[in-house]
Amino acid sequence: EEELQIIQPDKSVSVAAGESAILHCTITSLFPVGPIQWFRGAGPARVLIYNQRQGPFPRVTTVSETTKRENMDFSISISNITPADAGTYYCIKFRKGSPDTEFKSGAGTELSVRAKPS
């Protein structure tokens, strides 16, 4: 069985306030089964940004069609970026269970927010 890897290719992304940010994430295996979630920050204070198994998340859309049964692209777009959105975003694979348990995390992508051009 191929070991699942989570690839977040961008160490950092810079976006002007008011624009959309695309955060890339691909996985290398569908197994073990379980949802993908995105968080801003790490540890107990982290903030859930997107959860594959529940929604909606009004400002977040997936870049690819996640209803494809073979989909391995879980990149997201966050609209109308504000300074409050700055931080490091982690794409995390959970393994199914009661409750689902964290299986593997991407290395993270740091989002910085530039002032809106005047």
Partner: antibody
């Protein structure tokens, strides 16, 4: 409320074709994968085919591959099943079902009866 | 193939467990579907192993472990008489499979 209403069933002769429709309402149809499931008289449920939310990817059980085609028109909130070269073994009630994020089912239509008889 | 018992019976108020075996925990999610009469619309009572739709009574619960899933009805009622189908989605094959169904009789 989520509603799925199948239509297009009826009596056909062996070798003929039929197109089933499923009209969806009460949810954002274009965001969900969909499936067709059938039940032959006195038998259990049998999954036939699934389609991704955008319609680009389709999946079939081996026994209908090449004879049945699943498709959708998101502008009309409709799901279809084109059935060709029908045989008596295709006699069944055909249900459309909405898929969950992990390709199980949460909502079902009432079904439409297809009878193949000479 | 998913295997489930052909029939189970219980008295009102008892706890019923219906098992479904044959899937792979690593790659399979399970669901449970209730059909009160042949040809009538199935009703989803559990999906994603253990998730109960909001309109399904709390006496229905689901679990999965190893190669099997279990539907539990705690305090079964006469109106729970039905055929219960388990289904699995296998991420290796992209295919959904149903068990043959279990007829629940409430005595």
């Amino acid at each position: 409320d989520v509603q799925l209403v199948e239509s297009g069933g009826g009596v056909v002769r062996p070798g003929e074709s039929l197109r089933l429709s499923c009209a969806a309402s009460g949810f954002t149809f274009s965001s969900y994968a969909m499936s067709w499931v059938r039940q032959a008289p006195g038998k259990g449920l049998e999954w036939l085919a699934g389609i991704s939310a955008g319609g680009s990817d389709t999946y079939y059980i081996d026994s209908v591959k090449g004879r049945f085609t699943i498709s959708r028109d998101n502008s009309k909130n409709s799901l279809y099943l084109q059935m060709n070269s029908l045989t008596a073994e295709d006699t069944a009630v055909y249900y459309c079902a909405r898929e969950t994020w992990n390709h199980l089912f949460d909502y079902w239509g009432l079904g439409t009866l297809v009878t193949v008889s000479s | 193939a998913l295997t489930q018992p052909a029939s189970v019976s219980a008295n009102p108020g008892e706890t019923v467990k219906i098992t479904c075996s044959g899937g792979d925990w690593y790659s399979t999610y399970y669901g449970w579907y209730q059909q009160k009469s042949p040809g009538s619309a199935p009703v989803t009572v559990i999906h994603s192993d253990d998730k109960r739709p909001s309109d399904i009574p709390s006496r229905f619960s689901g679990s999965a472990s190893g190669s099997a899933a279990t539907l539990t009805i705690t305090g079964v009622r006469v109106e729970d008489e039905a055929v219960y189908y388990c289904a699995g989605y296998d991420g290796r094959t992209y295919i959904n499979t149903f068990g043959a169904g279990t007829t629940l009789t409430v005595l």
